[in-house]
């Protein structure tokens, strides 16, 4: 079998949903000494990067100008050491948002609820386009999908203080288009005094994880580098997989 | 937006060379990735070759790799390809292509990437 390097990391700078016309930033980590990076986009080349001095950085940024929707898709990356290709890496999911209208979002029986009550967002927008996304502030991986011709629910069953935090929907023309967000609504739960005071939100990984932290070598960084690599691929499994 | 305008085209026989201009007016050429596409008749824009912003690395696929050269002069506001050992599968309009990234370093092989072309320059090759 044709030996290969470890596939990089890809993630996006900041957020994976950009603003129609707004720059995107993808890094790619891969290996102290790569000579080159590919991005590719929907299974073609989309762009190269040399690093220089290539055994002095762990990976490159690649700033995709003018987001559109012709450029919101599966991005991937891969990198080479020598003459040798890494595999290829997860595949990154970018998403242009701002497309055409705004949604309305609601919340029953209201925005301020008891634990163990039962909620309904409801996600609303007249333009054409039939699946909705729910998402929450700070989980922005963790989208809800629902259908519907005009108006989308998301039943979110008997609600604990996990669920307590602000909610944004949007509407999709197609998997990478969303239109602008809604307004967001702010679920407050509230539970008796005991378990209130006691009972821990739940854990997030708020959008600024989503940061490059590509390291340029310098001996104390080595050590660095690999925490930020191991820490990076939990991080990824625990939202894709 | 940057106005882009290509020449030298024309027709040149097999194994010949051909250098094309791109000048640019409006915005400083600097401030551009660049790049080189070409579209045959009944074919999809094809990449040509692709030049960073600043550092003036270079990228091109198999098919010119050896044959074609990309290079540009800031100062000048104008990018070139130095075309040579032209091949008769070479023949088609060529275009210039610029993309407003802040990276220095980035090379763009993708036709998406760029947002300003030039209205391209034919170039025929007869064997």
């Known amino acids: 079998p044709k030996q290969t390097l470890p596939k990089p990391i890809i993630r996006a700078e900041s957020t994976y949903m950009v603003p129609k016309e707004k720059q995107a930033t993808l890094c790619c980590q891969g290996s102290y000494g790569a000579v080159e990076y590919q991005l590719h986009f929907e299974g073609s080349l989309f762009a190269v990067e040399r690093p220089k001095p290539p055994e002095r950085i762990n990976g490159v940024k690649f700033h995709i100008p003018d987001m559109n929707s012709r450029k919101a898709g599966r991005y991937s990356c891969i990198y080479r050491v020598g003459e040798l290709w890494s595999e290829r890496s997860d595949l990154l999911d970018l998403v242009v948002t701002e497309m055409y209208d705004t949604p309305t979002l609601s919340v029953h029986p209201g925005p301020e609820v008891t634990s163990g009550e039962k909620v309904t967002f409801y996600c609303r927008l007249d333009t054409a386009t039939s699946m909705f996304l729910l998402l929450k502030e700070g989980r922005s991986r963790d989208v809800q999908r629902s259908y519907g011709k005009v108006q989308a629910e998301f039943p979110m069953g008997p609600v604990t203080t996990a669920h307590r935090g602000s909610y944004r929907c949007f509407g999709s023309y197609n998997n990478y288009a969303w239109s602008f967000p809604s307004e967001p609504v702010k679920l407050l739960v509230t539970g008796d005094i005991e378990n209130t005071s006691l009972a821990p939100t739940d854990p997030t990984f708020p959008d600024s994880w989503d940061t490059c932290l590509l390291t340029r070598e310098t001996g104390l960084q080595k050590d660095l580098a690999l925490w930020d690599h191991t820490a990076q691929n939990h991080h990824h499994h625990h939202h894709h997989h | 937006d940057v106005q882009l305008v290509e020449s030298g085209g024309g027709l040149v026989q097999a194994g010949g060379s051909l250098r094309l201009s791109c000048a640019a007016s409006?915005?400083?050429?600097?401030?551009?990735?660049m790049g080189w596409f070409r579209q045959a008749p009944g074919l999809e824009r094809e990449f040509v070759a692709a030049i960073s912003r600043i550092s003036g690395d270079t990228y091109s696929p198999d098919s010119v790799k050896g044959r074609f050269t990309i290079s540009r002069d800031n100062a000048k506001n104008t990018l070139y390809l130095q075309m040579n050992s032209l091949k008769p599968e070479d023949t088609a309009v060529y275009y210039c292509?610029?993309?407003?990234?802040?990276?220095?370093?980035?090379?763009?092989?993708?036709?998406?990437?760029?947002?300003?072309w030039g209205q391209g320059t034919q170039v025929t090759v007869s064997s």
């Open positions: 409006g915005r400083t050429l600097s401030s551009y990735a």
């Open positions: 292509a610029a993309s407003a990234t802040p990276s220095a370093t980035n090379i763009y092989t993708n036709q998406y990437a760029y947002g300003d």
